[in-house]
Every structure is written in C-alpha cells, then in structure tokens.
Interface confidence: low
C-alpha cells in the first residue's frame, strides 16, 4: 500500500503540446487491475516540465473536469488532443 495526494495542475499548451506522454486505458492497463491513465514520460523543456509539478508515474484523474475513468487509451489520447490551449489536470501523486 502507498500514500497518494491529489493536485490540480493548470498547464498552457506550448509549441510542443503539453510536453508529456501517457500510458494506460481499459484496453492496455499500465498498472495491474487499474485502467487509469498515467504519465510515462515528461519532455525536457515542454510545458509540463517547465511547470514542474507533474511527475512521471502520476495518475491523471481528469482533464478539464472530464473524468478519465474507464476510457480506452485512444479515447484518452483524443481528450488530451482536444483539450484546448489552457488545460486543467487533476492528478494523483504517489508519495
């Protein structure tokens, strides 16, 4: 078992997008028995890296208020794609 904390992170989409990669989804579970969406890689100098709060391994719970539970990976990707310029992420950090 492990402790988690939640945080709201507001990012402004940069020239390279949001600057991180995701894994997970109901069709390709990244964590055993968990179909959630996780941050797999943060691009150096991207929007997320410059903000500094998002970490590899964080679970993304929602995008602009839209829940990421029980989504196919592709559907989650499309949510990020269409999230607009200002993107609000609800994330769960593992402590």
């Amino acid at each position: 078992d492990y402790l988690v904390t939640e945080e709201e992170i507001n990012l402004t989409r940069g020239p390279s997008g949001l600057g991180f990669n995701i894994v997970g989804g109901t069709d390709q579970q990244y964590v055993s028995n968990d179909s959630g969406i996780y941050v797999s890689e943060i691009d150096e100098n991207g929007a997320a890296a410059l903000d500094g709060r998002l970490q590899e391994g964080d679970k993304i719970l929602s995008v602009n208020g839209q829940d990421l539970k029980n989504l196919l990976h592709q559907d989650a990707v499309d949510l990020f794609r269409n999230a607009g310029y200002a993107v609000s992420l609800r994330v769960q950090h593992r402590l």
Epitope: P15, S16, G17, L18, N21, I22, V23, Q28, S40, E41, D43, E44, N45, G46, H73, Q74, V77, F80, R81
Partner: nanobody, 126 residues
Framework: HVQLVESGGGLVQAGGSLRLSCAAA????????MGWFRQAPGKEREFVSA????????YYADSVKGRFTISRDNAKNTVHLQMNSLKPEDTAVYYC???????????????????WGQGTQVTVSE
C-alpha cells in the same frame, strides 16, 4: 497544419544504405512527434520508427532495430531515417507522418498520426 515531403528513396543493392529525409512545411516540425511507416505491395502499412519532438526518445520496429536510425533537425524542420544493411524485404513505399500528441503505447499505430507525406519508393535488389 503541416505538409510533409519525403525524399531520398531509390534503388539500392542488398547490404547497401539509403538516407530518407522528411521536410515539414507549414509549421515547425518540432511541434510534432514524427514517425516513419512503410507499405509493401499487397501489405498493410507498418510502423518503422518514430522520434519524439525533442529527439530524446526514439522507437523502432523489431525488424529494423540495429540497422535503421531516426534523427531530427528541428532547426531545419527535417527528420531523417538512416537505413543501413538493407534487405530485399525492406522494399516498400516509405511514408513520413506527424503526430501532435505523443503517446508511447501507440507509436506503431498509423491512426495516431495527424499528417502524412506522399511517400518515397525504396527498392532493395538481391
């Protein structure tokens, strides 16, 4: 919107090398992850290689690992695919593709890519 133009294809003997280039116009290629795919006659388009926007992360199909190298020059809006030790089974039309949002699990999926070039023919003879 981004337009992609491939070049560098041609006819080469088995064991030889080619260097493909993909030039991006319309927006800087550094806005995008870039991939190379190929399609042989009568076969589905298949993933070859991809590179993230910064060039830090590269990905390869098992069939080309150790022989092909992908790189990018964001200053020139160009992505390169250096192909060494070519085999007849590498014969195909090679396509460059651009993807706005990068997602590690789907580099291999053509449906993930937003923009495509017209392709360049690579023929490897025995």
């Amino acid at each position: 919107h981004v337009q992609l133009v491939e070049s560098g294809g041609g006819l080469v003997q088995a064991g030889g090398s080619l260097r493909l280039s993909c030039a991006a116009a319309g927006r800087t290629s550094s806005d995008y992850a870039m991939g190379w795919f190929r399609q042989a006659p009568g076969k589905e388009r298949e993933f070859v290689s991809a590179i993230n926007w910064s060039g830090i992360s590269t990905y390869y199909a098992d069939s080309v690992k150790g022989r092909f190298t992908i790189s990018r020059d964001n200053a020139k809006n160009t992505v390169h695919l250096q192909m060494n030790s070519l085999k007849p089974e590498d014969t195909a039309v090679y396509y460059c593709a651009a993807e706005k949002l990068e997602s590690l699990r789907n580099w291999h999926d053509p449906l993930m890519y937003d923009y495509w070039g017209q392709g360049t023919q690579v023929t490897v003879s025995e």
